[in-house]
């Protein structure tokens, strides 16, 4: 059985301010078990954008129904994009751990660029 990989097929995405950005991510396996999280940026200061396990992320919706037991599509949509949302977004697979989940694999990242609304 091949080891799980996280695929972010888009190196970059350009979205007009006020529109919705779609950030694509798929996993190549269902195992090991553990949640997917999305971050903006890398390293210790990265910003959590979406956590499959818990939390309230009003601007974020998932493209697929994550309650399907065979789901491997973890793409998200972020609504009402502003220039402040620009940055590189990473889809990260965690494996279950105790007491905390452990980062297992990250996608290569998708750079979101925001085109200002014409005045």
């Amino acid at each position: 059985e091949e080891e799980l990989q996280v695929i972010q097929p888009d190196k970059s995405v350009l979205v007009a301010a006020g529109e919705t950005a779609t950030l694509r991510c798929t996993a190549t396996s269902l195992i090991p078990v553990g949640p997917i999280q999305w971050f903006r940026g890398a390293g210790p200061g990265r910003e959590l954008i979406y956590n499959q396990k818990e939390g309230h992320f009003p601007r974020v919706t998932t493209v697929s129904d994550l309650t399907k037991r065979n789901n491997m599509d973890f793409s998200i949509r972020i609504g009402n994009i502003t220039p402040a949302d620009a940055g590189t977004y990473y889809c990260v697979k965690f494996r279950k751990g105790s007491p905390d989940d452990v980062e297992f694999k990250s996608g290569a990242g998708t750079e979101l660029s925001v085109r200002a609304k014409p005045s």
Epitope: L30, I31, V33, P35, D65, T67, K68, R69
Partner: antibody
Framework: EVQLVESGGGVVQPGGSLRLSCAAS????????MSWVRQAPGKGLEWVAG????????YYPASVKGRFTISRDNSKNTLYLQMNSLRAEDTAVYYC???????????WGQGTLVTVSS | SYELTQPPSVSVSPGQTARITCSGG??????YAWYQQKPGQAPVTLIY???KRPSNIPERFSGSSSGTTVTLTISGVQAEDEADYYC???????????FGGGTQLTVLG
Amino acid sequence: EVQLVESGGGVVQPGGSLRLSCAASGFTFSSNAMSWVRQAPGKGLEWVAGISAGGSDTYYPASVKGRFTISRDNSKNTLYLQMNSLRAEDTAVYYCARETWNHLFDYWGQGTLVTVSS
Amino acid sequence: SYELTQPPSVSVSPGQTARITCSGGSYSSYYYAWYQQKPGQAPVTLIYSDDKRPSNIPERFSGSSSGTTVTLTISGVQAEDEADYYCGGYDQSSYTNPFGGGTQLTVLG
């Protein structure tokens, strides 16, 4: 407050059919996967069906596959279990349960008793 | 037959610590939970995701995992803890929810 209320249980003859319902309240029903779990008298718990939040995907153990059908109506906040070709060994209390993000159960209904007997 | 294995019974004196183990699932494809059931009542979820406790469950209930075995620990057991305890799982490799056969906890005295 999360509430799950089952109904539809009763006595049915072997080979007969029954449809159970579970009315959900206190949470966004359309966002959660749901399951049915049963317990035969004096026995342990047995999972019998699961369904995704949108209702498109269903899951069953071998013991009931082809006889039981789980479904849901998100506009009515209601979960269903259609049971056909019932056997004596299907006699049990049937519980509906809400699933967590990773398909474990966090809330349970009080259960409804199904008795299959001639 | 049950896919997960747990002892049929455990006895403990009030104030002591009870431990119930459960095994049978692959670590990489399983999540575990613990459910308490008192006679004539519906199950109540004590632990989910191997070791997470819902906010309404007393702190004396805790879960831990080591390899393919998970353990429910009840510290400072009280008479009201006398019940059946079920280990349940989610198996990502088969999309199923197996249970253990249940453990009857008896509080002595």
